[in-house]
């Protein structure tokens, strides 16, 4: 037989706390134990579950755990079943709730001198005791026209008056604990002698010199007083108006009228209502003066046909916010269609050339109206007026290539030469009409040129070949004055080019023929051995059939080229002594000598007292100093040639003679001693 060693017993439990219903059985064979609640099997949950044979509660729940529990033991082999005694919980709990109006049925029905009943919806077991509070202060029974019915959890105010106004709350406590109202009730019973707002003034925006009206009404018994004040606390009455409110009128119903409003009237107006009792009620409203500023300028817009574009109109700053609309040709744009207004945007869908023109954005408010135009251009692809042509341009003269196109807006033209963009410089210029000017045509300008004409809608291009008509010219022009070395072989070249290869010949300027030792070989004048008589004026003549002839005059000088008779030597001088650098040159014409010291030419007129250049070319430096050290160059030149030679000058300290050295001992290096 199945025997219960421990049976569950009824017990007190606290809401939300742990509990255990014990059950232990003894049986000859294996049994399984389960629990019933009000006759229905109990399913294990995280909150309520079997713990061995006992039933454990992690948190007692007054709703789910109310009822009769029974422990059942069953032998599944024999089918024998035993049931324990019934057990239940006496669950102690308390739960917060709101303070609600029980009587009258609605807040709107609360009047002075009526009975008002409030109910505290805090529940619990055992039944809690209640405490009421107004504005946080406890209320005791029978005090100040109110009764507390603890049994009914009610607070009755009999009769209710203004002195009962406030925030009502309740708290309750029992053996389980304490709870306070989750939502409180504000009782507002107007004192008829207190001022109450009937009509509050609103902010107003008016145009300059227009009128503004503020409405303000209070009610009370007896009737309340009403006063208007402007910003600086100046009272406004029909008898005493401040200087800046001369045109103010206060009506019997409390409204304030301001006529011919000026900027100084803008600001805050206060309407103050005062009842026989209670605090004053202050209502504020602001008078704004309407204003509207200028609109920002639009940049002209260029659109392409077929596209969809938008132009945003930014309303000007203003009060109130200005409304915005678009017009075209004096007609307000619709809100739908192909060209329409959406909000403050002008929308052009599938743009056509005919949409081009001036569109006007208007903005307006109480202060006035502003407008701003935007010029819309519908771009077209350029078309040809004159394409560039293959051209023959004369060398040395200006050359022109046309690229004349038309489009809206005016197309931009760029030129390419051999696929390279031509940037305008001293030789190339692109005119406003697209024509390219080459200021002085050169032979290498003969190539391909391409012009491209563009607008935002697209571009066109064409190319042309330039052939340069070469002029008859010397290449290079012979030097007009040349020298030949006496008694030596000499050549004077002359070459030319032209549209046809020119023939070149030399002749003496006086027309006389060339001596037999002088030959003219394809433009090169050759002197086998130069004589004095070969000096003089010669002319090189280049000619061809189509271009005629050109002449170049050359004056030939026969000279004995420069040689140095005496060259300066490496020289070392004691500081304070005199240095002599010798230099003598010969040649025909007689050469002139110049000196260069330390990388600058020594100007004989600016040498100063220490330096001097002799007639024969020698350079003398007196009282030498260390800074005179350096390389000195002797330059000899005449009209035919120039030669130079150089030597270093060293300036050293004079050594102090040693005892062993005799007075006649030679210095350790070559010196000039003076």
């Amino acid at each position: 037989a199945i025997v219960f060693i421990k049976q569950p017993s009824s017990q007190d439990a606290l809401q939300g706390r742990r509990a255990l219903l014990r059950c232990e059985v003894e049986a000859p064979g294996p049994v399984h134990v389960y629990w019933l609640l009000d006759g229905a099997p109990v399913q294990d949950t995280e909150r309520r579950f079997a713990q061995g044979s006992s039933l454990s509660f992690a948190a007692v729940d007054r709703l789910q755990d109310s009822g009769t529990f029974q422990c059942v033991a069953r032998d599944d082999v024999t089918g024998e079943e035993a049931r324990s005694a019934n057990a239940s919980f006496n669950i102690k709990w308390i739960e917060a709730g709101p303070v609600v109006l029980k009587h009258p049925a609605s807040e709107a029905e609360i009047q002075p001198q009526t009975q008002v009943t409030l109910r505290c919806h805090i529940d619990g077991h055992p039944r809690p005791t209640y405490q009421w509070f107004r504005d946080g202060t406890p209320l005791s029974d029978g005090q100040s026209n109110h009764t507390v019915s603890s049994k009914e959890r009610n607070l009755t105010l009999r009769p209710a008056g203004p002195e009962h106004s406030g925030l009502y709350s309740c708290c309750a406590h029992s053996a389980f604990g304490q709870a306070c109202s989750s939502q409180n009730f504000t009782l507002s019973i107007a004192d008829e002698s207190f001022a109450r707002v009937v009509l509050a003034p609103q902010d107003v925006v008016v145009a300059r010199y227009e009128e503004a009206m503020f409405h303000c009404q209070f009610s009370a018994q007896p009737p309340p007083s009403l006063q208007w004040l402007f910003e600086d606390e100046t009272p406004i009455t029909n008898r005493s108006r401040p200087p800046h409110l001369r045109r103010a009128t206060v009506f019997a119903n409390g409204s304030l009228l301001l006529t011919q409003v000026r900027p100084r009237n803008a600001g805050i107006y206060r309407c103050i209502g005062q009842g026989q009792r209670g605090p004053p009620i202050i209502l504020e409203a602001t008078l704004h003066l309407a204003e509207i500023e200028d609109m920002p300028l639009f940049e002209p817009r260029v659109f392409t046909a077929g596209s969809e574009e938008r132009v945003t109109c930014l309303p000007p700053k203003g009060l109130p916010e200005p409304s915005v609309w678009w017009e075209h040709a004096g007609v307000r744009l619709p809100t739908h269609g192909r060209v329409y207004q959406k909000g403050h945007e002008l929308v052009l869908a599938n743009i056509a050339e005919s949409d081009a023109g001036v569109y006007t954005c208007h903005a307006a408010n109480l202060a006035g109206q502003r407008r701003q135009d935007v010029n819309i251009t519908v771009a077209t692809v350029p078309s040809w007026l004159k394409k560039p042509q293959d051209s023959q341009l004369e060398e040395g003269k200006p050359g022109y290539l046309d690229c004349l196109t038309q489009a809206t807006p005016k197309p931009t033209v760029v030129w390419y030469r051999n696929q390279m963009l031509i940037s305008e410089d001293s030789r190339f210029e692109v005119f406003k009409n697209g024509t390219l000017r080459i200021n002085s045509v050169e032979v290498y300008d003969g190539t391909w040129y391409r012009c491209m004409s563009s607008t935002p809608a697209g571009s066109i291009e064409a190319q042309a070949r330039v052939q340069v008509l070469e002029k008859l010219k010397f290449t290079p022009p012979p030097q007009p004055q040349q020298c030949m070395e006496f008694d030596k072989e000499a050549t004077v070249p002359c070459s030319a080019t032209g549209r046809e290869k020119p023939t070149i010949k030399w002749e003496r300027a006086d027309g006389s023929s060339l001596p037999e030792w002088v030959t003219d070989n394809a433009g090169t004048l050759h002197f086998a051995r130069v004589t004095r008589d070969d000096a003089g004026n010669y002319t090189c003549i280049a000619s061809n059939g189509p271009q005629g002839q050109i002449r170049a005059h050359v004056q030939l000088t026969v000279a004995v080229f420069i040689t140095f008779k005496v060259e300066p030597e490496r020289t070392t001088v004691y500081q304070g002594h005199t240095a002599l650098l010798q230099c003598e040159a010969q040649g025909d014409p007689k050469p002139l000598i110049q000196w260069k010291g330390k990388d600058r030419i020594l100007d004989p007129t600016k040498l100063g007292p220490r330096m001097h250049i002799f007639q024969n070319g020698s350079l003398v430096i007196h009282d030498v100093a260390p800074e005179d050290s350096g390389r000195y160059t002797c330059i000899a030149g005449n009209s035919c040639n120039i030669k130079h030679t150089e030597a270093p000058l060293y300036v050293v300290d004079k050594p102090v003679p040693e005892e062993s050295e005799g007075p006649g001992s030679p210095p350790p290096y070559k010196m000039i001693q003076t």
Partner: antibody, heavy 116, light 107 residues
Framework: QVQLQQSGPELVKPGASVKISCKAS????????MNWVKQRPGKGLEWIGR????????NYNGKFTGKATLTADKSSSTVYMQLSSLTSEDSAVYFC?????????WGQGTTLTVSS | DIQMTQTPSSLSASLGDRVTINCRAS??????LNWYQQKPDGTVKLLIY???ILHSGVPSRFTGSGSGTDYSLTISTLEQEDIGTYFC?????????FGGGTKLEIK
């Protein structure tokens, strides 16, 4: 006084959708465009799209086509943005904004967190 | 889409300094260029619209300039309250686009 009041923060799971709102007050609602802007944490601003409150016409940034859907309720002066097929990349602050020259107003932003 | 390139991406300056932020668009904007300031708390405020018009209530130390594709925002004398991130935004061609932002810090 112009105000744009946006709905509160949202925490949603990847793959789900969310609808955030922006209530306008204090200006003529029906003749304005309302814009939506996205800002990922520590990043810049991205324009999502806009809706014309008069007729519900919309323009979207191509990047957000299919992701965002803008609608408006004229009677309550409220605009909505629905974001669908949410991923972690959609976690951001979303602003509604009315741009009109000097009359420029932004909502306070709605934080969307997409997390499993 | 129009690309907006904002430089520098961050800068640190001393109080009283003159600060300039640049914005370059990939195509002309016809002056439809706005500058916004975003405070560290996330609030966004318009400073300049239509390239150079100062938004109501914005201090006059902020100025905007530029045309075509190149625009700039200058703060003539930097103040502590100017810290934040600055964005340029074009309103010429849909979709509207923003610059990457310039974070301004005080040295």
């Amino acid at each position: 006084q112009v105000q744009l009041q946006q709905s509160g923060p949202e925490l949603v799971k990847p793959g789900a959708s969310v609808k955030i709102s922006c209530k306008a007050s204090g200006y003529p609602f029906s003749t304005s465009w309302m814009n939506w802007v996205k800002q990922r944490p520590g990043k810049g601003l991205e324009w999502i799209g806009r809706i014309y409150l008069g007729d519900g016409d919309t323009n979207y940034n191509g990047k957000f086509t299919g992701k965002a859907t803008l609608t408006a309720d004229k009677s309550s002066s409220t605009v909505y943005m629905q974001l669908s097929s949410l991923t972690s990349e959609d976690s951001a602050v979303y602003f509604c904004a009315r741009w009109r020259g000097d009359y420029d107003y932004w909502g306070q932003g709605t934080t969307l967190t997409v997390s499993s | 889409d129009i690309q907006m390139t904002q430089t520098p991406s961050s800068l640190s300056a001393s109080l009283g300094d003159r600060v300039t932020i640049n914005c370059r668009a990939s195509q002309g904007l016809s002056n439809y260029l706005n500058w916004y300031q975003q405070k560290p708390d996330g609030t966004v405020k318009l400073l300049i619209y239509y390239a150079s018009i100062l938004h109501s209530g914005v201090p006059s130390r902020f100025t905007g300039s530029g045309s075509g594709t190149d625009y700039s925002l200058t703060i003539s004398t930097l103040e502590q309250e100017d810290i934040g991130t600055y964005f340029c935004q074009q309103g010429n061609t849909l979709p509207w686009t923003f610059g990457g932002g310039t974070k301004l810090e005080i040295k």
